[in-house]
Amino acid sequence: EDELQVIQPEKSVSVAAGESATLRCAMTSLIPVGPIMWFRGAGAGRELIYNQKEGHFPRVTTVSELTKRNNLDFSISISNITPADAGTYYCVKFRKGSPDDVEFKSGAGTELSVRAKPSAPVVSGPAVRATPEHTVSFTCESHGFSPRDITLKWFKNGNELSDFQTNVDPAGDSVSYSIHSTARVVLTRGDVHSQVICEIAHITLQGDPLRGTANLSEAIRVPPTLEVTQQPMRAENQANVTCQVSNFYPRGLQLTWLENGNVSRTETASTLIENKDGTYNWMSWLLVNTCAHRDDVVLTCQVEHDGQQAVSKSYALEISAHQKEHGSDITHEAALAPTAPLGGSG
């Protein structure tokens, strides 16, 4: 009778995580007497996966009924495969012996690769906001996928980005892999409503890529533009000065009026008008009792936005000669009118 051969017909098997893997093995003979065992890996560090002779292997079932003597099929099925199960599996015939069974012949091995889906991509933006025309970085991370081949793309409002760098770790063989990508995005004033999207394509996703998103509203600060103007008034002894604060984001804004450098009134923006591009407008006005002033008045609208250094705009209010003649020495506190919204600038 010809010497026993151990046949592992498949060089490789690929299985999706969570499924069962069937590893095929056949013997050409029943001789010699002794058990078959399955190992992952070779050499001294190999891991016992199944031993026909003894042991408890809850995830392993034999494909054929091994208690039938004429059975030469020693294929096994391993349930609930995870990426940690990847490796080369060897079907090995032993000859009965003492003190240990003697390895008689091994199959050529079957490489088990596990297809594992990447985790949902997590996109994170910069820790601090930046202003338009500046470049900010967004990162995208996904983990636990196998095999290593993966495609990552970045989009801003549907337009593919090109300025990004991607790494897949580890560089060598591993049971599963992680991807990390950093994209550089130049902010524009209209980016409050913009989104960046990280899109990942992998063999396990069957053409339906995973996406992670981040809103540029979390990353952008659009500083306000200020305009101070005088509105016409019926009353001769009153002047109405408005401060139009336009196109700012985010909402947080504090406005201070100064008369000749002295704080007249401070208020926090509350009822804001939202523009189509996501920025906000706000208007504040100041009623100035002109008869309280002998000389011209410099009115300053000072705005502190989102914790940044204050910006200001001044307006010189001219006091007419007639008002000066009839003016009083008593300085009245300037009356600050309640705020009123200004129509959106679109």
């Epitope: 001789i31 007497v33 002794g34 078959i36 002779k53 003597r69 012996g97």
Partner: antibody, heavy 118, light 107 residues
Framework: EVQLVESGGGLVQPGGSLRLSCAAS????????MHWVRQATGKGLEWVSA???????YYTGSVKGRFTISRENAKNSLYLQMNSLRAGDTAVYYC????????????WGQGTMVTVSS | DIQMTQSPSSLSASVGDRVTITCRAS??????AAWFQQKPGKAPKSLIY???SLHSGVPSKFSGSGSGTDFTLTISSLQPEDFATYYC?????????FGQGTKLEIK
Amino acid sequence: EVQLVESGGGLVQPGGSLRLSCAASGFTLSSYDMHWVRQATGKGLEWVSAIGTAGDTYYTGSVKGRFTISRENAKNSLYLQMNSLRAGDTAVYYCVRGGVWDDAFDIWGQGTMVTVSS
Amino acid sequence: DIQMTQSPSSLSASVGDRVTITCRASQGINNYAAWFQQKPGKAPKSLIYTASSLHSGVPSKFSGSGSGTDFTLTISSLQPEDFATYYCQQYVSYPYTFGQGTKLEIK
């Protein structure tokens, strides 16, 4: 049903011969290592002989050269040809099937009595 | 040849008792030890193979353990049908050899 049935035992004079048969049913005898085990009255079990699936044969020292184990696949039967019998060979002879992969005894026949006496 | 030494040769016990029979091989036999039960006038019955594996249909009150040279058969709760003679065997190499037997008697 898996079964082994021995036959051929009896009374024989010292120096005589006897051929024991074991008819297997419920399985293919040629696919298993097969054994003969004997037990003298009031004594323990003694392994006598075996035949492997490849036709390889094995004997205990006391019967070597006198006993021959064989099988006939067409009849699904095992045999033990016993020559030059001695009083010490008197025993019940059991036909036993070896296990699937390790040759552990799993199926026993009911036994046949061999008496060697003048 | 490998010698198999069983102890005790005989043992008296009561129904419900837990009993242990030991077997020592004269040299290492890996775990190729088997245990058999025989009742008077009957053929032996296979109980355990590879030291601890139960043959099909054998109740779980029978258990075996050991490796190398020392092996045990334990019957967890004796029933009247368990009173019999028990044999150990090595089957790692020819000639296969049996222990001399342990007769388990009712007390």
